[in-house]
């Protein structure tokens, strides 16, 4: 029985050239998190954080992705092409898989505000 819920930063915006933190949090379960996958909308993986093996950033994103904080992910040097959906997939035992969604909008405007609001998708 999956009792947990994923809280995410929801819909966020950030300015071109800047950076943004993608954050998910799993709550309401005692399940052990064995791995967290960070994916883009096309299911391509940006990074994973395995409980035993640590962080690994996919080669294509090495220059622009930094692990953390926590199980989150920091995207740097944002471009307009970074606009879109991002998913955190929590692999847990014994519950199974939980998935959270974040929508990032990259703005040209210098007044773009980075929303840090948490919400349940």
């Amino acid at each position: 029985m999956m009792t947990g819920t994923i809280e995410t930063t929801g819909n966020i915006s950030a300015k071109k050239g800047g950076s943004v933190i993608l954050q998910c949090h799993l709550s309401s379960t005692m399940a052990q998190v064995t791995q967290v996958n960070w994916e883009q909308h096309d299911h391509s993986l940006l990074a994973i954080r395995n409980a035993e093996l640590g962080w690994h950033i996919y080669p294509a994103f090495k220059d622009r992705v930094a692990p953390g904080p926590g199980l989150g992910l920091t995207l740097q040097s944002l471009t307009m092409n970074d606009t879109g959906e991002y998913f955190c997939t929590y692999h847990t035992y014994p519950d199974g898989t939980y998935r959270g969604r974040i929508f990032l909008e990259v703005l040209e405007s210098s007044v773009a505000e980075h929303s840090a609001r948490f919400q349940i998708p």
């Epitope: 996958n37 640590g54 080669p59």
Partner: antibody, heavy 119, light 106 residues
Amino acid sequence: EVQLQQSGPELVKPGASVKMSCKASGFTFTDYFMDWVKQSRGASFEWIGRLNPNNGRTSYNQKFKGKATLTVDKSSSTAYMELNSLTSEDSAVYYCARGDLGRWYFDVWGAGTTVTVSS
Amino acid sequence: QIVLTQSPAIMSASPGEKVTMTCSASSSVSYMHWYQQKSGTSPKRWIYDTSKLASGVPTRFSGSGSGTSYSLTISSMEAEDAASYFCQQWSSNSLTFGAGTKLELK
């Protein structure tokens, strides 16, 4: 060409240890995980464990904890597996394989190292 | 740990025949991967992420499934397809393989 070159066959006595190697070429070694898989004669596969070459951290199948030790030499792009306290049950072909990070499949396999345990 | 049961264990097919083999998981899994192995050689990644064909795999192969039930299908058997096929999954605490389906040419 992406390749995993494994060391040659081993004939060892019961109770002994053996260390085999897997040299990677044709790709950036630290961009992937390295896995080890056992195939007993005429049987299926058992996953032994996985190594993160960047930090040397490992993840093992519970069954092989204490039996297998995975290590790495980043400078030579080589992964190693040592098996200890060998018995006839350890006679098998051992493969190293390049592991996908997120989905945990193996996209490149070595040719295998045959280990025979016999007195 | 999740047990993968492949069926049939052995099967034979004539050239041009449609072939389907299955892999049943003891608990739900997110993805299934398949490998082809010919006698005396190392396995080759064949289908990954349930339905994606590895580079060089003929398009007569396909993979499908979800939850606990997955399958590999060959739309029209060819001689070079004779081999053993193994399914594999990773879930949060285990990576396991099926015992394999040996496909022979009739």
